[in-house]
């Protein structure tokens, strides 16, 4: 009953993180224009991967798509295939989960076939939610990166007046759900290889089998042996389930969202 | 086609305040924001502020920010400017615009502040 | 807050004759997010409210002839009007359409010479 909870859950969670995923990659407020020094701006600019916007007085927003491939800078080529990648692996995770579900039963789908494909979706799910966290925090750190360089160059005009102020941007709203999708998504992937666990068949006792040897009418009755992986061959022997599955996954570490002014 | 239409003239005596209205059709009422503009007699234009009808949002133009009150009524489609403690200089033609570039404007509402 | 300065305050040019009327902000309207400058021009005539004939400095509202065209970038903007008709005679004002409060040229008044 726990681990069709805990897989469940993991894959709830995981398509919510995955769904987080693909909505942040398709907003557009990936960044947004700082209004520290210019709170009054009647025209706000915002930028996401695909293309830029420009919310003007009336209310009007246009956005320009960006039509380009090789004129935009690698780093943010690096976000949009990270952010697929992550969309790509978290779908296909989620595809092979719902298979891999307890609840559903396809077939005559044994219990060792269903773990397989448990781990299997919840690494996938790992990985998804890591390159989703990986592609935001790049972003973000070209932000910060370009924001201070903006601030340092920020005024420039004629004879100390100032004629243009050089628009900063600053973190959008979609960096923030694309943290926390990549981490529903990176949890759920946990929760999927815990699950997982608890699916496998860890032990397995060989019923007593006799051999006669020549001459003797003796009964060898051997030990039961221990099965060496949890995905045992043997499937017409007789599968013991460990019900307390045990977490010994190494403790996920988050990144650490810094604060800047 | 886009149309604003607004209230009918209003004569104020100080310190009375007046609400004109303005009434879009032919457009999204929540798509765009609804500005308003002071012209008094002869002289230029003057920017009061705007209402957002979508989130109900304001933008003041700090001269009328204490005075000035907007508010829209998205059912009816209509967009108010409420001026209250009206003086003598407050005697002008109210417009309201909207559209990109404030491309439409109302017909304007002459407002006289008078003892 | 932004001031415009419209040059001249009256202007009496011939028909069929050119007509430049100019604007000056005192901080840029120039948009970096999308390379745009920020700035409207309008036309009054007496009774009426006013008409949108160009915004973002150089782009004529639909329904605007084509005599009229708008140009500048930065701080310094022009209107102008390559073939004047009897109908042009009105009042002419810029707007900053960048920051707000929003603000208005005093106006350029335009007459028949």
């Known amino acids: 009953m726990a681990v069709t909870a805990c897989q469940g859950l993991g894959f709830v969670v995981s398509l919510i993180g995955i769904a987080g995923i693909i909505a942040a990659t398709c907003m557009d407020q990936w960044s947004t224009q700082d209004l520290y020094n210019n709170p009054v701006t009647a025209v706000f600019n915002y930028q996401g991967l695909w293309r830029s916007c420009v919310r003007e007085s009336s209310g009007f927003t246009e956005c320009r798509g960006y039509f380009t491939l090789l004129g935009l800078p690698a780093m943010l080529q690096a976000v949009r295939a990270l952010m697929i990648v992550g969309i790509v692996l978290g779908a296909i995770g989620l595809l092979v989960s719902i298979f891999a579900l307890k609840c559903i039963r396809i077939g005559s789908m044994e219990d060792s076939a269903k773990a397989n494909m448990t781990l299997t979706s919840g690494i996938m799910f790992i990985v998804s939610g890591l390159c989703a966290i990986a592609g935001v925090s790049v972003f973000a750190n070209m932000l910060v990166t370009n924001f201070w360089m903006s601030t340092a160059n920020m005024y420039t005009g004629m004879g100390g007046m100032v004629q243009t102020v050089q628009t900063r941007y600053t973190f959008g709203a979609a960096l923030f759900v694309g943290w926390v999708a990549g981490g529903l998504t990176l949890i759920g992937g946990v929760m999927m290889c815990i699950a997982c666990r608890g699916l496998a068949p860890e032990e397995t006792n060989y019923k007593a089998v006799s051999y006669h040897a020549s001459g003797h009418s003796v009964a060898y009755k051997p030990g039961g042996f221990k099965a060496s992986t949890g995905f045992g061959s043997n499937t017409k022997n007789k599968k013991i389930y460990d019900g307390g599955a045990r977490t010994e996954d190494e403790v996920q570490s988050y990144p650490s969202k810094h604060d800047y002014v | 086609q886009v149309q604003l239409v607004q209230s009918g003239a209003e004569v104020k005596k100080p310190g009375a305040s007046v609400k004109v209205s303005c009434k879009a059709s032919g457009f999204t009422f929540t798509s765009y924001n609804i500005h308003w503009v002071k012209q008094a007699p002869g002289q230029g234009l003057e920017w009061i502020g705007y209402?957002?009808?979508?989130?109900?949002?304001?933008n003041y133009n700090l001269k009328f920010k204490d005075r000035a009150t907007m508010t829209r009524d998205t059912s009816i489609s209509t967009a108010y400017m409420e001026l209250s403690r009206l003086r003598s200089d407050d005697t002008a033609v109210y417009f309201c615009?909207?559209?990109?570039?404030?491309?439409?404007w109302g017909q304007g509402t002459l407002v006289t502040v008078s003892s | 807050d932004i001031v415009m300065t419209q040059s001249p305050d009256s202007l009496a040019v011939s028909l069929g004759e050119r007509a430049t009327i100019n604007c000056k902000s005192s901080?840029?309207?120039?948009?970096?997010?999308?390379?745009?400058?920020?700035l409207i021009w309008y036309q009054q005539k007496p009774g009426q409210p006013p008409k949108l004939l160009i915004y973002r400095a150089s782009t004529r509202d639909s329904g605007v002839p084509d005599r009229f065209s708008g140009s500048g970038s930065g701080t310094d903007f022009t209107l102008t009007i390559s073939s004047l008709q009897a109908e042009d005679v009105a009042v002419y004002y810029c707007q900053n359409d960048y920051s707000y409060p929003l603000t208005f040229g005093g106006g350029t008044k335009l007459e028949i010479k």
């Open positions: 209402i957002s009808p979508g989130n109900g949002g304001s």
């Open positions: 615009a909207t559209g990109r570039g404030f491309a439409y």
């Open positions: 901080q840029s309207l120039f948009n970096s997010g999308n390379q745009k400058n920020y």
